[in-house]
């Protein structure tokens, strides 16, 4: 029987290799192989300061796989020098390119600075480097630009240790002075560049219509057309203040809807430091300013000021316990100032203004009191002006400012009122200043 032998066929298949990949400039390829066939892959890594880009679009990683038709599944990316782009603008400041004009690539250096005199840099020294991650970064590691904070407590006034019984203010003497119209005439003091500190009673009637408050800064004459206009974004009245029931917690903050430009006529007042009490002892001199009633019984045309000494708290409490002022309304949240002989005082229309003191260590003025209340007859002998004691409210002020933001939104929408109310009934016989 014949033997049968069949065909023996051996199939061998050689996968078509992919084109040999060339790493882009400033990049390297891994793994390096003699050839790359089906399902082989490679990755591209860029040198420090260079980033993977596919066109304009960034990639964190790149890997290509060899396909069965002998082509790579994606094109080679580039390794481009990291470009941090133009640095953010600095409000009230500027940026200088140190490495070279408009150079924004890896290791480039820029220097932020604030407008001299009226602003100071907060957070860091203003030097930023373009790092490999593509962010402008300070020596402390911050990616956000610094902040130019207004310098507070600057005054043109030559400090006199030597408004009712007062003198005329000159330009730049009280650059924190704010005139508040809309209800009755009142005052306030600028904090930072978009907050006004005032008395709760001064704006209470407008609390639900904050946008009606006509807020004027940089004015010297009450009726002058030369001033900077501001509007309220929100009003914050102390939750412990009860209108027409005593004057405890007579403090409020107004957030402006835009930051104001600081200059020699518009500068914020400083808040008191912890050590400030040492400049507000009995007989220390504070200065109150305003457009309130003068000795002639009329609202002042020109901004007036008066230098008045702090009065011993017990003496002040006693003065207001005598008829017709009985009621013991002077609390630990208040301080008193004035002359026992009378003649120098704040008065109606000065409400909400600042009683300021010079910090002898920093040579800056700070707000120690807010004009609140006093006897019916301003400057009366044996009676004193009563002021909200600001140092007691530093946590309240800082809490509101941090929670409700430093920057005015400048956006639309109606101004709002924020407060928590605890009503208590109590009679009083004193007038609001």
């Amino acid at each position: 029987m014949a033997s049968m032998t069949g065909w023996k066929i051996h199939y061998t298949s050689t996968a078509q290799p992919c084109p040999y990949p060339m790493a882009p400039p400033n990049g390297h390829l891994s793994p390096v192989q003699a050839k790359y066939i089906l399902k082989d892959s490679f990755s591209i890594f860029c040198e420090p300061g260079y980033e993977l880009l596919q066109g304009h679009l960034p990639l964190k990683s790149f890997a290509a796989v060899c396909q069965k038709d002998g082509s790579w599944d994606q094109p080679m990316p580039s390794c481009s020098i990291v470009d941090c782009g133009p640095p953010d603008d600095l409000p009230s400041g500027r940026v200088e390119y140190i490495t070279g004009p408009e150079v924004t690539t890896y290791k480039a250096v820029i220097q932020y600075s604030c407008e001299e005199t009226f602003y100071t840099m907060k957070v860091n020294d203003g030097k930023y480097v373009c790092e490999a991650d593509g962010f402008w970064t300070s020596s402390k590691g911050e990616r956000s630009p610094p902040v130019c904070e207004p310098v507070c407590g600057l005054s043109a006034r030559t400090t006199g240790g030597r408004i009712y019984g007062g003198q005329k203010a000159k330009p730049g003497d009280f650059p924190w002075q704010v005139l508040i119209l809309g209800g009755s005439t009142a005052a306030g003091a600028l904090l930072y560049d978009n907050w006004v500190l005032t008395a709760a009673h001064a704006i209470y009637e407008q609390k639900h219509d904050a946008s009606s408050l006509d807020i004027r800064l940089g004015a010297l004459k009450r009726l002058s057309p030369h001033y900077t206009q501001a509007w309220a974004e929100a009003v914050f009245i102390h939750e412990g203040y009860t209108h027409d029931a005593g004057f405890d917690n007579d403090i409020a903050l107004i957030k402006l809807n835009n930051k104001v430009v600081i200059n020699s006529n518009i500068t914020p007042i400083c808040l008191p430091r912890k050590e400030a009490e040492s400049f507000m002892r009995t007989d220390d001199i504070g200065t109150a300013s305003g457009w309130g009633l003068t000795q002639r019984g009329l609202l002042a045309r020109n901004l007036m000021y008066v230098d008045i000494p702090i009065v011993d708290h017990q003496k002040c409490t006693a003065a207001y316990e005598k008829p017709p002022y009985s009621g013991g309304s002077v609390t630990a949240n208040m301080l008193c100032a004035g002359l026992e002989s009378g003649g120098k005082d704040s008065c109606r229309g000065d409400s909400g203004g600042a009683l300021v003191f010079l910090d002898n260590e920093t040579q800056r003025w700070f707000v120690g009191g807010i004009v609140s209340w006093g006897s019916m007859n301003c400057g009366e002998a044996g009676q004193y002006g009563v002021y909200t004691k600001v140092i007691n409210y530093i946590p309240w002020i800082k809490n509101i400012i941090s929670n409700f933001g430093g920057g005015g939104s400048g956006g639309g929408g109606s101004a709002k009122f924020v407060a928590a109310w605890t009503l208590k009934a109590a009679a009083h016989h004193h007038h609001h200043h």
């Epitope: 596919q54 066109g55 304009h56 679009l57 960034p58 990639l59 964190k60 990683s61 994606q74 094109p75």
Partner: antibody, heavy 114, light 107 residues
Framework: QVQLQESGPGLVKPSQTLSLTCTVS?????????WNWIRQPPGKGLEWIGY???????SYNPSLKSRVTISRDTSKNQFSLKLSSVTAADTAVYYC???????WGQGTLVTVSS | DIQMTQSPSSLSASVGDRVTITCKAS??????VAWFQQKPGKAPKPLIY???YRYSGVPSRFSGSGSGTDFTLTISSLQPEDFATYFC?????????FGGGTKVEIK
């Protein structure tokens, strides 16, 4: 499967700020790529608004740069668009998209009208 | 900004036809061009990236070519589901830009 979903108000008043959020599922926005916003006015072509990259860097169309902010919330795997001072010309379908467009959201129509 | 000029702006074709759409960039964009298909009321659907790379799941009748300033999208045999508007897109240079679109209609 990578999915993107836009959300936000469909009607915005002139001069106000348009705010939209893109929620990404199936991929972490910090893992890689650029996460874009693109818009298309009714009956018109596509316009790139800007992106936020995996590292948090942003790039904006210069024609809109002064009004645009793109940010992200990595804990929610979302990125957001804010466009301020809107006018009727900002009425469009707004899309979010990954990279140069391999994945897109379905789009959301935003009308600017009083 | 780089202008991406698409032509034609619209065309009429029949099922089975070979359709070619071109896109001209106002300056060199390398091969950083993508093509999208969009149907009314829908988001754009990606077809091609890096001028000639097809996204997975995209039928092989769609192909892209070109580099530098001249790019082409070809549909080798038009299917009923291909009637739509097609956009080119350059992602080479900031700001990213799109072509004005080509509407492919049934003849």
């Amino acid at each position: 499967q990578v999915q993107l979903q836009e959300s936000g108000p469909g009607l915005v008043k002139p001069s106000q700020t348009l705010s939209l959020t893109c929620t990404v599922s199936g991929y972490s926005i910090t893992s890689d790529y650029a996460w874009n916003w693109i818009r298309q006015p009714p009956g018109k072509g596509l316009e790139w608004i800007g992106y936020i990259s995996y590292s948090g860097r942003t790039s904006y169309n210069p024609s809109l740069k002064s009004r645009v902010t793109i940010s992200r919330d990595t804990s929610k795997n979302q990125f957001s668009l804010k466009l301020s001072s809107v006018t009727a010309a900002d009425t469009a379908v707004y899309y979010c998209a990954r990279y140069w467009g391999d994945y897109w959201g379905q789009g959301t129509l935003v009308t600017v009208s009083s | 900004d780089i202008q991406m000029t698409q032509s034609p702006s619209s065309l009429s074709a029949s099922v089975g036809d070979r359709v070619t759409i071109t896109c001209k960039a106002s300056q060199n964009v390398g091969s950083n061009v993508a093509w999208f298909q969009q149907k009314p009321g829908k988001a754009p659907k990606p077809l091609i990236y890096s001028a000639s790379y097809r996204y997975s799941g995209v039928p092989s009748r769609f192909s892209g070519s070109g580099s530098g300033t001249d790019f082409t999208l070809t549909i080798s045999s038009l299917q009923p589901e291909d009637f739509a508007t097609y956009f080119c897109h350059q992602y080479n240079t900031y700001p990213l830009t799109f072509g004005g679109g080509t509407k492919v209609e049934i003849k």
